[in-house]
Interface confidence: low
């Protein structure tokens, strides 16, 4: 398996934004490159968005993702938006390199993600 | 050494406040515990409160300090406020069991605070 | 043992296609990848192509347009044309399982680490 | 497409020597570099991968070295066995380029 880095742990911001760095040992200059979010809590894991960045398209995900991210060199840097403290979790990096062959696959050991709800404001009078 | 137990991270709330449980295996029933708490950051340790509690004084700290505390049985329950999040960092809980003879000392091994700031309210026009 | 074996006419006439098959034993073609490399007569090594062992194929940009490479797993075989040959294309032709080798953080690092003894082609009229 | 530039392009020696061989990329390869030797009318043998590490069955006499973009190839003592040439190729992207060899003779 290719080796992928990620940090251990990650506070969001007060808005429930958490942004963090993905990197891969590429084995080989990858053209192709799939990024895929896993999210993990009580053993339960589902993915959270996907993209894939080529040599040309080095910024990912759909428009209607939570995710954005940016490819330079053998990182990826994400930011994962929209988060309450019920999306507090293990949000696990998986790299696919998928061109040219041969097929790498890589999984990070998962970013401790810690979500605060802020409290409402008072309402003005 | 006496065992000191503490969770391992706790999330202030948006407000500044961490809650945590600092158990201690008392190897006997002591009448007079020390309670200290220490904040580890960029390898320095400072002291955030301590308070001495008995078996009439179950409530603990001093009015001016950040810390409240109740003590019940073997542990403790500990409360910091006003924290921002330049004080997010380790905090240590360090029981001393004073009273009676032998003194016995326990570290805990840190609770890992993390204090995310409040986005301010709007002002209200 | 790991063993390969290239075959195929010694002379080729210009502007035919060049056939070479590549015979592999003792490893298996669902697992590992193959590339072609030749040799000129008193020269150096090049690398021609591979192909992986989910069928993904990789050629070297000067010959792309010339090249297919193949595989026929049922008779562990794999094939190489080169067509609208010329003089330019005499050389000692060679097969080599090409394997990524793992070691110590865990991600690859490619070698061609068996090689066949080579098929000597001319082409000439 | 990555240039590998190996020197030098010929080397005579006597049996004991200790030989070194040096193969400079055109840009960093991330030790992503095997070593080979060729004798005369035979398939070319792999005796290093990934800069370093020795294939199965390669004496330990054969070390590699290097980072980046230059890497190197040492023979603590050579053997009569030895006398061949030897190839670097780099495998990070393709197309995957070799040196363009060292020939090693006896003096």
């Known amino acids: 398996a290719m080796h992928v880095a990620q940090p251990a742990v990650v506070l969001a911001s007060s808005r429930g934004i958490a942004s963090f760095v993905c990197e891969y040992a590429s084995p080989g200059k990858a053209t192709e490159v799939r990024v895929t979010v896993l999210r993990q809590a009580d053993s339960q894991v589902t993915e959270v968005c996907a993209a894939t960045f080529t040599e040309k398209n080095t910024v990912g995900f759909l428009d209607d993702s939570i995710c954005t991210g940016t490819s330079s060199g053998n990182q990826v840097n994400l930011t994962i938006q929209g988060l309450r403290a019920m999306d507090t979790g293990l949000y696990i990096c998986k790299v696919e390199l998928m061109y040219p062959p041969p097929y790498y696959l890589g999984i990070g050991n998962g970013t401790q993600i810690y979500v605060i709800d802020p409290e409402p404001c008072p309402d003005s009078d | 050494a006496m065992h000191v137990a503490q969770p391992a991270v706790v999330l202030a709330s948006s407000r500044g406040i961490a809650s945590f449980v600092c158990e201690y295996a008392s190897p006997g029933k002591a009448t007079e515990v020390r309670v200290t708490v220490l904040r580890q950051a960029d390898s320095q340790v400072t002291e955030v409160c301590a308070a001495t509690f008995t078996e009439k004084n179950t409530v603990g700290f001093l009015d001016d300090s950040i810390c409240t505390g109740t003590s019940s049985g073997n542990q403790v329950n500990l409360t910091i406020q006003g924290l921002r999040a330049m004080d997010t960092g380790l905090y240590i809980c360090k029981v001393e069991l004073m009273y009676p003879p032998p003194y016995y000392l326990g570290i805990g091994n840190g609770t890992q605070i993390y204090v995310i700031d409040p986005e301010p309210c709007p002002d209200s026009d | 043992q790991v063993q390969l074996q290239e075959s195929g006419p010694g002379l080729v006439k210009p502007s035919e296609t060049l056939s070479l098959t590549c015979t592999v034993s003792g490893f298996s073609l669902t697992s590992y990848g193959l590339s072609w490399i030749r040799q000129p007569p008193g020269k150096g090594l090049e690398w021609i192509g591979y192909i992986w062992y989910d069928g993904n194929t990789n050629f070297h940009p000067s010959l792309k347009s010339r090249v297919t490479i193949s595989k026929d797993t049922s008779k562990n075989q794999f094939s190489l044309k080169l067509s609208s040959v010329t003089a330019a294309d005499t050389a000692v032709y060679y097969c080599?399982?090409?394997?990524?080798?793992?070691?110590?953080?865990?991600?690859?690092?490619?070698?061609?680490?068996?090689w066949g003894q080579g098929t000597s082609v001319t082409v000439s009229s | 497409d990555i240039q590998m530039t190996q020197s030098p392009s010929s080397l005579s020696a006597s049996v004991g020597d200790r030989v070194t061989i040096t193969c400079r990329a055109s840009e960093n390869i991330y030790s992503n570099l095997a070593w080979y030797q060729q004798k005369q009318g035979k398939a070319p043998k792999l005796l290093l991968y990934?800069?370093?590490n020795l294939q199965d069955g390669v004496p330990s006499r054969f070390s590699g070295s290097g980072s980046g973009t230059d890497y190197t190839l040492t023979i603590s003592s050579l053997q009569p066995e030895d006398f061949a040439t030897y190839f670097c190729?780099?495998?990070?992207?393709?197309?995957?380029?070799f040196g363009q060899g060292t020939k090693l003779e006896i003096k």
């Open positions: 080599a399982k090409t394997e990524g080798h793992y070691y110590g953080s865990n991600y690859g690092y490619y070698a061609l680490d068996y």
């Open positions: 990934a800069a370093t």
């Open positions: 190729q780099h495998l990070w992207g393709t197309p995957y380029t």
